[in-house]
């Protein structure tokens, strides 16, 4: 079927970066400036995305791939393919409808984006707070009481997967 289709449809021979031009007897024509086709057999080329205003160009448009945008400093991407730019706040703040607001007491945000989250409640696990939380970071809980008993082993357990830089950086 594929072979038959290609015999019947000359457009299937048009590679990425071209389109099948009905106005020119279905020959493969290069995509015009500021347009692209990322797959073969296209009957039109797509208009390149333009990174304007708060968006800036991360990757230029080519005849075979669309431009990619990111956000100017002070903003970060949201949505698939960076469809929106949202204002950064400082660590210890969150973005509200009225702008950046400090985290309420008992909450923290260690990033320039996202919302303030509650400090960990160490006492839920029977642990104490060794270092208080701040607006910018969570508390440090003590170890479990079992770790501190006279018979406790000092052997280091195997490391779980830790996020790079959680803020252990």
């Amino acid at each position: 079927f594929e072979r038959t289709r290609s015999l019947q449809d000359p457009c299937s021979n048009c590679p990425a970066g071209t389109f099948c031009d009905n106005n020119r007897n279905q020959i493969c024509s290069p995509c015009p400036p500021n347009s692209f086709s990322s797959a073969g057999g296209q009957r039109t080329c797509d208009i390149c995305r333009q990174c304007k205003g708060v968006f800036r160009t991360r990757k230029e448009c080519s005849s075979t791939s669309n431009a990619e945008c990111d956000c100017t400093p002070g903003f970060h991407c949201l949505g698939a393919g960076c469809s929106m730019c949202e204002q950064d706040c400082k660590q210890g703040q969150e973005l509200t409808k009225k702008g950046c607001k400090d985290c309420c007491f008992g909450t923290f945000n260690d990033q320039k984006r996202g919302i303030c989250r509650p400090w960990t409640n160490c006492s839920l696990d029977g642990k104490s707070v060794l270092v208080n939380g701040t607006k910018e970071r969570d508390v440090v809980c003590g170890p479990s009481p079992a770790d501190l008993s006279p018979g406790a082993s000092s052997v280091t357990p195997p490391a779980p997967a830790r996020e790079p830089g959680h803020s252990p950086q």
């Epitope: 260690d110 400090w119 960990t120 696990d125 642990k127 060794l130 270092v131 208080n132 939380g133 701040t134 910018e136 970071r137 969570d138 508390v139 440090v140 809980c141 170890p143 479990s144 770790d147 280091t156 357990p157 490391a159 779980p160 830790r162 830089g165 959680h166 803020s167 252990p168 950086q169």
Partner: nanobody, 114 residues
Amino acid sequence: QVQLQESGGGLVQAGGSLRLSCAASGSFNAMGWWRQAPGKQREFVAIITRDGSTNLADSVKGRFTISSDNAKNTWFLQMNSLKPEDTAVYYCSASDYGSSLYYWGQGTQVTVSS
């Protein structure tokens, strides 16, 4: 596997000083020191966070200081005016903000003679 290695323990006379070091194979946000005397529970000595916040047990305040070299994943316990009751095995610990997981070194013996 995370490795923590203490060094600097030893025998010292009362009133003397020692400096303990702990080197970690990874990066952590909360680095501490604990001690355990024979037959007793392991007790908190000092802790420092990556941003420099510190907390020391009341029994060592004014005598011990904790510091760190974040770039080298190493932290230190400077112990001055040592007393016989400071005799114990000293363990370094590593954890993260909000984490219930602790990593421990193997311990280094500190003995203070009178």
